[in-house]
Amino acid sequence: SAGAGSHCQKTSLRVNFEDIGWDSWIIAPKEYEAYECKGGCFFPLADDVTPTKHAIVQTLVHLKFPTKVGKACCVPTKLSPISVLYKDDMGVPTLKYHYEGMSVAECGCR
Amino acid sequence: SAGAGSHCQKTSLRVNFEDIGWDSWIIAPKEYEAYECKGGCFFPLADDVTPTKHAIVQTLVHLKFPTKVGKACCVPTKLSPISVLYKDDMGVPTLKYHYEGMSVAECGCR
């Protein structure tokens, strides 16, 4: 699995809704693949981490002043929806095909 | 300044183009305010860090399994341009009013 020593990448993160207390309103699925962005944003930032100009600048400043400025951070840059069966305001089981922003599609350095 | 103990916020980061080796092609300014996003993404994530659903989920999973899953990360969520006088391909000083993505406008938890 991607640790601090490896470069920024998407790794598996299975989330159980009961663990986070969302089982009170999400009926199904019981768990889903959320993914997580893990790893470091090391110099030089590769194209696959789609760095912004600011991330490139911050990486260069960190290189010169590592104690003063932090590295860019490996975060989700694109998210995907999942389908959920949830309880609506009245508690009635209701299907949302596209519950946006729940799963990582892409990671990058920001 | 905002450290790991404080919550995610925008802090000052003056960048000198000579320090990062960009003075070879950026003529002016000599330095600029890039800002940096610093601080932690602690539970509960406040509205001002505009968390995505994934960031909220990851924060809740981190709360339950702190050694297995990291916190969401404080990163730039909106960037601003700066104006630069640079040398074009032929070395001619050229003004770019909007050199995009160089300065942090907003920080958030992602």
Epitope: I27, A28, P29, L85, D88, M90, V92, P93, T94, Y97 | -
Partner: antibody, heavy 126, light 110 residues
């Protein structure tokens, strides 16, 4: 236009099981919940349970818990209701009814049972 | 015994107005929408009113629904012979997590 067509009448012995089918045509099966409602002779309507085929999630009225199983086959757009340990009081007409579950539909209509199947008479007799 | 209470029967002459009441509690009618179904002799029920007071297409405007507190009612004006049927009210019960029906009201057109 959505239509629900149910299987034919059944005569069963006490203690046995019955499985009634409900085939949907028209519309998108994954947008539905299929519910089962029964009506004993000369009596009112009684909700038994429902299933959301998209996730295969079923929920039941307490009264029938453990005795009823509702399933669905998305490939054939068919829902099934199986009732076990039959007794004479289970003699009734069993109806399937659609409820739209997708939240892209206004909540007022989303909670309605519409349309209904033609009904299946199940007679439990020794 | 049904969770929602309806009168067993009502009657009226052709052209008259009749109302059918449906009484519930705070966990069903009091907090959720009410639905009315018409069941003609020997046929399956048919949706008549949805969301308290909405008519599906094809249902004459002689039929109207209303709700106040924990009670609802169905009004039929200009009574016709073909209105002779059983009428059922229905709502979701938030507390019990079930769909509940009234016992049904038999309408006789004199």
């Amino acid at each position: 236009q959505v239509q629900l067509v149910q299987s034919g009448a059944e005569v069963k012995k006490p203690g046995s099981s019955v499985k009634v089918s409900c085939k949907a045509s028209g519309g998108t099966f994954s947008d539905y919940a299929i519910h089962w409602v029964r009506q004993a002779p000369g009596q009112g309507l009684e909700w038994m349970g429902g299933i959301i085929p998209f996730f295969g999630t079923a929920y039941y009225a307490q009264k029938f818990q453990g005795r009823v199983t509702i399933t669905a086959d998305e490939s054939t757009s068919t829902a099934y209701m199986e009732l076990s340990s039959l007794r004479s009081e289970d003699t009734a007409v069993y109806y399937c009814a659609r409820r739209i579950v997708s939240d892209s539909v206004a909540v007022q209509y989303r909670h309605a049972f519409d349309p209904w199947g033609q009904g299946t008479l199940v007679t439990v007799s020794s | 015994q049904s969770v929602l209470t309806q009168p067993p029967s009502v009657s009226g002459a052709p052209g008259q107005r009749v109302t059918i009441s449906c009484s519930g509690s705070s966990s069903n009618i009091g907090s959720n929408y009410v639905y009315w179904y018409q069941q003609l002799p020997g046929t399956a029920p048919k949706l008549l009113i949805y969301g308290n007071n909405n008519r599906p297409s094809g249902v004459p405007d002689r039929f109207s629904g209303s709700k106040s507190g924990t009670s609802a009612s169905l009004a039929i004006t200009g009574l016709q012979a073909e209105d002779e049927a059983d009428y059922y009210c229905n709502a979701w019960d938030t507390k019990a997590y079930v769909w509940v029906f009234g016992g049904g009201t038999k309408l006789t057109v004199l």
